[in-house]
Amino acid sequence: LPGVGLTPSAAQTARQHPKMHLAHSTLKPAAHLIGDPSKQNSLLWRANTDRAFLQDGFSLSNNSLLVPTSGIYFVYSQVVFSGKAYSPKATSSPLYLAHEVQLFSSQYPFHVPLLSSQKMVYPGLQEPWLHSMYHGAAFQLTQGDQLSTHTDGIPHLVLSPSTVFFGAFAL
Amino acid sequence: LPGVGLTPSAAQTARQHPKMHLAHSTLKPAAHLIGDPSKQNSLLWRANTDRAFLQDGFSLSNNSLLVPTSGIYFVYSQVVFSGKAYSPKATSSPLYLAHEVQLFSSQYPFHVPLLSSQKMVYPGLQEPWLHSMYHGAAFQLTQGDQLSTHTDGIPHLVLSPSTVFFGAFAL
Amino acid sequence: LPGVGLTPSAAQTARQHPKMHLAHSTLKPAAHLIGDPSKQNSLLWRANTDRAFLQDGFSLSNNSLLVPTSGIYFVYSQVVFSGKAYSPKATSSPLYLAHEVQLFSSQYPFHVPLLSSQKMVYPGLQEPWLHSMYHGAAFQLTQGDQLSTHTDGIPHLVLSPSTVFFGAFAL
């Protein structure tokens, strides 16, 4: 409970300001989502399984993370793509793979790209193939902001809890 | 010293709860390890050299980071692989490179993959070659949990303090 | 304002130690810079545009981030490189791409690499091509330290706010 074992004034402060940070307190918004492995041709984020979690106000709605309070957050995501041998047919042109974390905010009427990673792979030249993309950064976000992802190459995702994930935490 | 220069009640709180966070206080578990460059065919983590450190309870045992207190931690790691030019007769079969951060916990009798990155490189196709892998995410960890890494392609690691590292910090 | 709505002793503590962390307080050094898209053959960091910011003491001087107070910081950066289609006679010699975050400190008379990622791409073999590099880690930094980047392959950078960035935040 907030304030347990604190001196009276500190206990009172903690009760009034439960977000006051005692190290390792879990009272800081954080989320870690994993890609649903049962959905092979889409990327649906899940919070109620494996190592995934939503904490202290973060929620998942319409496949987007909803920012609980205004502040600076570190936002991150990873995807891993793969392709089998001889997957392309009559082309040697590359496959475009991309992963982006986007912000939808009341301040803007469109999705703003926050983090983008891109790759061209040449399945006709190199098979089987595997490619990982990771990115993360700090952003000033506002309560109610929506964080979502857009991925090019979804059929090629390697969907497991340790390979495809998306998260954020307040600083 | 904890509590120096604080008002009496805050000083008492800080003494009793030394983890209470004053910005830039170093009283938050954090660790940054680097791969030992003197060990060419293994990946041994070191904390007592270069920019590496263990702080506020983190320890390194059996090449694993021991989590000092329960809470949410951001865990990260990077590796860089390279390969020299091969003979013209080099096979065109791919080389599988992978790096994984694993959790060994009293809750599970096996290593759980937390972060995984993978790559196929084709040494016969592209030589010399270089490839970097990075990943990081937030996880709910328990005191006594062990964080370790597993790497495929260790002989190809570019072992330097800025290329091969492993770390974690409490949020 | 620091201390508003706190109990007297906590208010006094917060006034004396304004950096004391109330969750989501912005009183924690953080910075996120983006590569200036108007400068095609150099990588100039900007803080006054798009999602970029400097907070609580961080400043940008001579294209370097100046560390405002001693402590542990998470430092990160990303770059994305691309290359256009070449003629069939394009050289098959590789292009070396690298990105490094460096520390210049009063403790050392030279730039120390903190984070390094590297890649060889073969433009004659695979065109067009795209490649992303990301890295980040926790470092013990000292007030006045300078964080900068060095990039090989600057003409190939894909300069946008979501693809090329550099940042840090105090833990």
Partner: antibody, heavy 114, light 113 residues
């Protein structure tokens, strides 16, 4: 079911322009190149070029560079071929194709005549 | 540009015949590092779009009858129809996708004798 459906063909005057559409359905569109191939009446197949919808990268047959422009709208899963300065010899059935999966559209006829 | 030359330009055959069409490229289509030939064969019937039959010179596309086979390497390639069926009367094209621009052979028309 995977489908590529071309539209926008018809009669055009010499010197005129035309924009052809290729609407894709039944598969994820953005990662795979869309190729444009044409076939003049009674003749063989001629490759015009290709576009990667996700990255907007393009490759053109030099014979069409300057007159052909590829574009794509990922939100509509549609690729476009804009042809300018049309001549009688541009009369052909224009096909879009996805070579990665081996899909072809049914084609759309462009007739350039006064 | 890589030139693709098919022969014959047309042929007459009967149902049940074994038919062979050849395709020569002006440079090798073999990618040495993975030992694959960047060549496809298409079938086209009047008023219809081309249909992919064979890719990587010898891999049959899904749903293509086993009587169709592709062979060859480097610059010389062959499409074989082991036992011609009524629905096989069509024009056949080879295409290289080794380099830009992609190029097609001029076509081989298979007619009923």
């Amino acid at each position: 079911e995977v489908q590529l459906v071309e539209s926008g063909g018809g009669l055009v005057q010499p010197g005129g322009s035309l924009r052809l559409s290729c609407a894709a359905s039944g598969y994820t569109f953005s990662s795979y190149w869309i190729e444009w191939v044409r076939q003049a009446p009674g003749k063989g197949l001629e490759w015009v070029g290709e576009i990667s919808p996700g990255s907007a990268s393009t490759n053109y047959n030099e014979e069409f560079k300057g007159r052909a422009t590829f574009s794509a709208d990922n939100s509509k899963n549609t690729a476009y071929l804009q042809m300018n300065s049309l001549r009688a010899e541009d009369t052909a059935v224009y096909y879009c194709a996805d070579g990665y999966h081996g899909y072809w559209g049914q084609g759309t006829l462009v007739t350039v005549s006064s | 540009d890589i030139q693709m030359t098919q022969s014959p330009s047309s042929l007459s055959a009967s149902v049940g015949d074994r038919v062979t069409i050849t395709c020569k490229s002006s440079q090798s289509l073999l990618y040495s590092t993975n030992q694959k030939n960047f060549l496809a064969w298409y079938q086209q019937k009047p008023g219809k779009a081309p249909k992919l039959l064979i890719y990587w010179a010898s891999t049959r596309d899904s749903g293509v009858p086993s009587r169709f086979s592709g062979s060859g390497s480097g610059t010389d390639f062959t499409l074989t129809i082991s036992s011609l069926q009524p629905e096989d009367f069509a024009t056949y094209y080879c295409q290289q996708y080794y380099s830009y621009p992609r190029t097609f052979g001029q076509g081989t028309k298979v007619e009923i004798k």
